[in-house]
């Protein structure tokens, strides 16, 4: 059963990056408002974003409680404003979202190269360990804290003077690579979760090149 004068939400979509998770839907409301409910498969339906005219709801606080759970959301439509009222007690119209498992599906945010340091013919490249909104013991966890060894980084590097790229991989946040003495190199990294079937890779980080401020060089 539904309430008169309302349109059910549609195109319910999860938008999630590094566990920052927002449910989006359509349409823009006319004489109606929305309330979102979220649940785990075995849990209770918890109301969020009460009676909103927005078409998105930030559900980060809920999903970070257990990122390995599978969540389902639903969006209720209620008539609002100066509309004809029936006094109906029936359950309002609602639409279910697709299921969403944050650990398996959140997009990996674009990584950042924190620093690189050259020591002779070796370069140590460090990837910034981005903070997430996942908490443990009142402390925000980093991406590495959450994913552990499931998360790897791929480093792409090349001589500034050529286009031939080399790659390296690490399951930490550091690379140690061999370079030719006297050559400047450029670097880009990508976060990867090889075990995933969807959203396996992040976009590439901004390119950083030797001879710019990020690096430190020591000839030994």
């Amino acid at each position: 059963s539904g309430t008169t004068n309302t349109v059910a939400a549609y195109n319910l979509t999860w938008k999630s990056t590094n566990f920052k998770t927002i449910l989006e839907w359509e349409p823009k409301p006319v004489n109606q408002v929305y309330t979102v409910q979220i649940s785990t498969k075995s849990g209770d339906w918890k109301s969020k974003c009460f009676y909103t005219t927005d078409t998105e709801c930030d559900l980060t606080d809920e999903i970070v409680k257990d990122v390995k759970q599978t969540y389902l959301a639903r969006v209720f439509s209620y008539p609002a404003g100066n509309v004809e009222s029936t006094g109906s007690a029936g359950e309002p119209l609602y639409e279910n979202s697709p299921e969403f498992t944050p650990y398996l599906e959140t997009n990996l945010g674009q990584p950042t190269i924190q620093s690189f340091e050259q020591v002779g013919t070796k370069v140590n490249v460090t990837v910034e360990d981005e903070r997430t909104l996942v908490r443990r013991n009142n402390t925000f966890l980093s991406l590495r804290d959450v994913f552990g060894k499931d998360l790897i980084y791929t480093l792409y590097y090349w001589k500034s003077s050529s286009s031939g790229k080399k790659t390296a991989k690490t399951n930490t946040n550091e690379f140690l690579i061999d370079v030719d003495k006297g050559e400047n190199y450029c670097f880009s990294v990508q976060a990867v979760i090889p075990s995933r079937t969807v959203n396996r890779k992040s976009t590439d980080s901004p390119v950083e090149c030797m001879g710019q401020e990020k690096g430190e060089f020591r000839e030994i």
Partner: antibody, heavy 118, light 106 residues
Amino acid sequence: QVQLVQSGAEVKRPGSSVKVSCKASGYTFSSYWMYWVRQAPGQGLEWIGQIYPGDGDSNYNENFQGRVTITADKSTSTAYMELSSLRSEDTAVYYCTREGYGNRFAYWGQGTLVTVSS
Amino acid sequence: EIVLTQSPALLSLSPGERATLSCSASSSVSYMYWYQQKPGQAPRLLIQLTSNLASGVPARFSGRGSGTDFTLTISSLEPEDFAVYYCQQWSYNPPTFGGGTKVEIK
């Protein structure tokens, strides 16, 4: 049907604490937000705070922050509102109220009169 | 916080008459709720989301308004309608209630 039954009237001394209970029946207790609202004699209504029994998530009115604690016991389907450092201005009827379709204060308990007097 | 001002504070009318109660918000709100309270009883929800009748509420009650100005209308007062009426908003935290309008028998 939804029923919210509150504990009986209380008389308290200034500086002491009071804990009011609200026993719910007729629905799945853990699935709905529970709110607390008070009404001083001859006055309007004031929201105190709320709890989601499913996970214990709670929020409070800043005016009561530090003095109020709202809890829920899923095993007995009972919500509690504890107010400390009582003063005479806290004399009021305290209501528990539950969300419904289209409104957060849809179902109300019968109220508990708390009198703070020396 | 949003302050809701109800007017008049007291409305003296006879059964069968039309009652119009006003609620003015200190800032624009999305929608308004209305409650009825009788002596010794808890408030009872009448209108939600500005104009929707709550379950079991007679059709003689209606709500309208937008922005800062909202009204509750009782088209023809019945003896059981004499009570105190409160408006309430939750567009902004904390939720707030108006001071009430008492509708008494003239």
